[in-house]
C-alpha cells in the first residue's frame, strides 16, 4: 500500500513578510518524526501521531516547502509551493528630455524594483490615461520601454508608468502602483532664420525701430528672444500670434558705437537657436552750422559767413564748396541795404557706405540802414478830382523799419498813406512825406493838385 504525506495549505499565496501555518500529515500508521524541509524560519507548533504543524514566519520570497517522513522502510515526501506577492518598492519613469522636437521619436523608460510574483506583474506606460505599451515585468529591476513619436498634442502631456499585480485568479484582487507623472514639452523650431527688419544706417543719439519675426514656431509663447545692437542688448517687446513670434525694439546708437555694427536677433526654443544678423552703420552727422560774424550788421560793415559740419562732411556755402570734407566754407561781404534779409544757404553731404546723406541749413542777415522813400513807388505830383476816392501809394524802407507820415505844409493836416481816403479840394497843396526811424529821417515832397468838381 502506498501512503501519502499531505502538506496543507497546497500552493498558498501570501503577502511578502507574512506568516503561514503549515500542516504535514500522513496516513502511514507510524509514529515517525515528520520533518519540514525549508530554508524559511520555522517553528514546530504541535505534533502527534502521523502529523506535525509548523509556523513559517517572515516569508519574503517564493519557496517550495517539503515534508518528509519515514514510512515502512521508505521515505515519503509531500510538497507545497508558496507564492509570495508583494507590490513593487519603486516604480519610476525615467526623466523625459527637457524639450522634444515634434516629429521625432523619444523613448519612455520605466524602472520597476521589486514586486512579485513577476509572472503576474505587468508594466503599463501611459500618456494621460491612454495606454502606450503593456509589457510583462521580467528582470530585476524590470525595465520597460516604449518609443513615442512626439506631436504638438504631447506638449504639456503627463506621461506615467503603472504596475499591475494581478492576483485576481488567487482571489486577491488587482494591485496598482503608479509612478509620479512626468510632463513632456514638445516644440517646433523652423530651420529658416528669423526675418530681421532694421535700418542700414543709424545716426548717433537717434532711435529707430527694429523688428524680428519668426513664423512656424511652437509653442511661440515659450521662445526666448535676444535682440542686440552690437553688444548692447535691446529691450524688446515680444508678441505671439498663433505660431508667429514678433519682437520689436528701439535701437538707439551711442557715440562709442560709431562705425560698422551688427544687429542680431536670436530666437531660442527647446535648447535650439535660430539667428538673423543685419549690418548697420552707426554714423555721426553734425551740422551743418551756419554762422554770421554779425547777425545784425551796419550798412557798409564787413560780414563773414561761415559753415561748418563734422568730420568727413563736405559743406557748400551759397554754392561755394569747402576746400575738403571736414573743413569750413566761408565768404565775406560788405553789408549793403540790399543784403538786408538775405539768406545764406549751406548744404552738407556725408558719404556712409556708398550712400550720400544730405542736410541743409540757412541763416538770414539783418543790415541796419537809414530810412528811404522809394520815389518809384511814391509819385511826387498827384492830380486828382474833387470828391473822388484815392490811395496815396508811398512806401518807405529801412532797418529798423521807418514810420511814414505825410503832413500838409503850413498845417498839421495828415493824409493817410496806403489807405483809401475821400479826396476833396481842401486836400489841395504841398505835402512833406517823412520816413523816420532811429537811424534818421528821409523827406519827400508830394504835391496834390485837386481839380474842383464842375457842375456843368
Amino acid at each position: 500500500q502506498e501512503f501519502l504525506l499531505r502538506v496543507e495549505p497546497q500552493n498558498p499565496v501570501l503577502s511578502a513578510g507574512g506568516s503561514l501555518f503549515v500542516n504535514c500529515s500522513t496516513d502511514c500508521p507510524s509514529s515517525e518524526k515528520i520533518a519540514l524541509e525549508t530554508s524559511l524560519s520555522k517553528e514546530l507548533v504541535a505534533s502527534g501521531m502521523g502529523w506535525a504543524a509548523f509556523n513559517l514566519s517572515n516569508v519574503t520570497g517564493n519557496s517550495r516547502i517539503l515534508c518528509s517522513v519515514y514510512c515502512n522502510g521508505s521515505q515519503i515526501t509531500g510538497s507545497s509551493n508558496i507564492t509570495v506577492y508583494g507590490l513593487p518598492e519603486r516604480v519610476e519613469l525615467a526623466p523625459l528630455p527637457p524639450w522634444q522636437p515634434v516629429g521625432q521619436n523619444f523613448t519612455l523608460r520605466c524602472q520597476v524594483e521589486g514586486g512579485s510574483p513577476r509572472t503576474s506583474l505587468t508594466v503599463v506606460l501611459l500618456r494621460w490615461e491612454e495606454e502606450l505599451s503593456r509589457q510583462p515585468a521580467v528582470e530585476e529591476p524590470a525595465e520597460v520601454t516604449a518609443t513615442v513619436l512626439a506631436s504638438r498634442d504631447d506638449h504639456g502631456a503627463p506621461f506615467s508608468c503603472r504596475t499591475e499585480l494581478d492576483m485576481q485568479p488567487q482571489g486577491l484582487g488587482l494591485f496598482v502602483n503608479t509612478s509620479a507623472p512626468r510632463q513632456l514639452r514638445t516644440f517646433v523650431l523652423p530651420v529658416t532664420p528669423p526675418r530681421l527688419v532694421a535700418p542700414r544706417f543709424l545716426e548717433v543719439e537717434t532711435s529707430w525701430p527694429v523688428d524680428c519675426t519668426l513664423d512656424g514656431l511652437f509653442p511661440a509663447s515659450e521662445a526666448q528672444v535676444y535682440l542686440a545692437l552690437g553688444d548692447q542688448m535691446l529691450n524688446a517687446t515680444v508678441m505671439n500670434h498663433g505660431d508667429t513670434l514678433t519682437a520689436t525694439a528701439t535701437a538707439t546708437a551711442r557715440a562709442d558705437q560709431e562705425g560698422a555694427r551688427e544687429i542680431v536677433c536670436n530666437v531660442t526654443l527647446g535648447g535650439e537657436r535660430r539667428e538673423a544678423r543685419e549690418n548697420l552703420t552707426v554714423f555721426s552727422f553734425l551740422g551743418p552750422i551756419v554762422n554770421l560774424s554779425e547777425p545784425t550788421a551796419h550798412e557798409g560793415s564787413t560780414v563773414t559767413v561761415s559753415c561748418m559740419a563734422g568730420a568727413r562732411v563736405q559743406v557748400t556755402l551759397d554754392g561755394v564748396p569747402a576746400a575738403a570734407p571736414g573743413q569750413t566754407a566761408q565768404l565775406q561781404l560788405n553789408a549793403t541795404e540790399s543784403d538786408d534779409g538775405r539768406s545764406f544757404f549751406c548744404s552738407a553731404t556725408l558719404e556712409v557706405d556708398g550712400e550720400f546723406l544730405h542736410r541743409n541749413s540757412s541763416v538770414q542777415l539783418r543790415v541796419l540802414y537809414g530810412p528811404k522813400i522809394d520815389r518809384a513807388t511814391c509819385p511826387q505830383h498827384l492830380k486828382w478830382k474833387d470828391k473822388t476816392r484815392h490811395v496815396l501809394q508811398c512806401q518807405a524802407r529801412g532797418n529798423p523799419y521807418p514810420e511814414l507820415r505825410c503832413l500838409k505844409e503850413g498845417s498839421s493836416r495828415e493824409v493817410p498813406v496806403g489807405i483809401p481816403f475821400f479826396v476833396n479840394v481842401t486836400h489841395n497843396g504841398t505835402y512833406q512825406c517823412q520816413a523816420s526811424s532811429s537811424r534818421g529821417k528821409y523827406t519827400l515832397v508830394v504835391v496834390m493838385d485837386i481839380e474842383a468838381f464842375s457842375s456843368h
Epitope: 507510524s30 509514529s31 515517525e32 518524526k33 520533518a35 524541509e37 514546530l44 505534533s47 517539503l66 518528509s68 519515514y70 522502510g73 521508505s74 521515505q75 515526501t77
Partner: antibody
Framework: QVQLQQSGAELAKPGASVKMSCKAS????????MHWVKQRPGQGLEWIGY????????EYNQRFQDKATLTADKSSSTAYMQLSSLTSEDSAVYYC????????????WGQGTSVTVSS | DIQMTQSPSSLSASVGDRVTITCSAS?????IYWYQQKPGKAPKLLIY???NLASGVPSRFSGSGSGTDFTLTISSLQPEDFATYYC?????????FGQGTKLEIK
Amino acid sequence: QVQLQQSGAELAKPGASVKMSCKASGYTFTVYWMHWVKQRPGQGLEWIGYINPNTDYTEYNQRFQDKATLTADKSSSTAYMQLSSLTSEDSAVYYCARWGGNSYGLDYWGQGTSVTVSS
Amino acid sequence: DIQMTQSPSSLSASVGDRVTITCSASSSVSYIYWYQQKPGKAPKLLIYLTSNLASGVPSRFSGSGSGTDFTLTISSLQPEDFATYYCQQWKSIPLTFGQGTKLEIK
C-alpha cells in the same frame, strides 16, 4: 548488514579545510537521514547537523552553521562533511550516524574520523 | 535550545549494584534516547522512545519518565556495563545530548 565506514584521520593546519566521508552500505541510502556528531577528547557528544540524502535538505546546529557543510552523493551512497577555517577548537573525533526513525534513534554509527589541527 | 542535564556526572559502583542515572530536560519533551559509549568506540543505542530496549540490549537496562524528567536504570551491574551514558532529545532543532554520566568500577 548496515555499515557506516568513515574516512581516515586528518592532520590539518589552522585556517585550512578538511572534507571527510561516510560511506553507507547494507541499506537504502536515500531513505534515512544522516547525522554528524562531534566529540572533543574527554568531552561529551555535540550534534552538528543532518542531511536528508533523498532531498539534499540540511539542518545545522547554529553553532556549526558557518563551520560545517553537509553534502551527499546518492550514486555512491556517501555522505560528506567539510570543515572550514580550522582552529585548534576543531580538533575532535567526528561521527556520522544514521537516524533509523523514532523507533531506532541514531541506530548505526561510523567508527569516527579524528581531526587534528596543528601548525 | 533544549538543555539536557544528567546526574550524576560520574558514579562508582560495584558489579551487581543497581544503578540509576537521571536526565532532566529544560522544557518538556515527548521522549528521549539513551546511548552507551566505551573509550575509543562510537556510541551505541540502548533505549529508544524513553523506555524501549534496542535490539541486542540486555533486559537489565530499563528506561522511564515523561515531560522533563527521565531515568536509566541498570538493575544488576555487569563488568561490561562500565562506560559513559548519554541521554538525547530531538523534539526541536538542535538535537541535544546530556553531558554524559561516567560509570566506573568501585
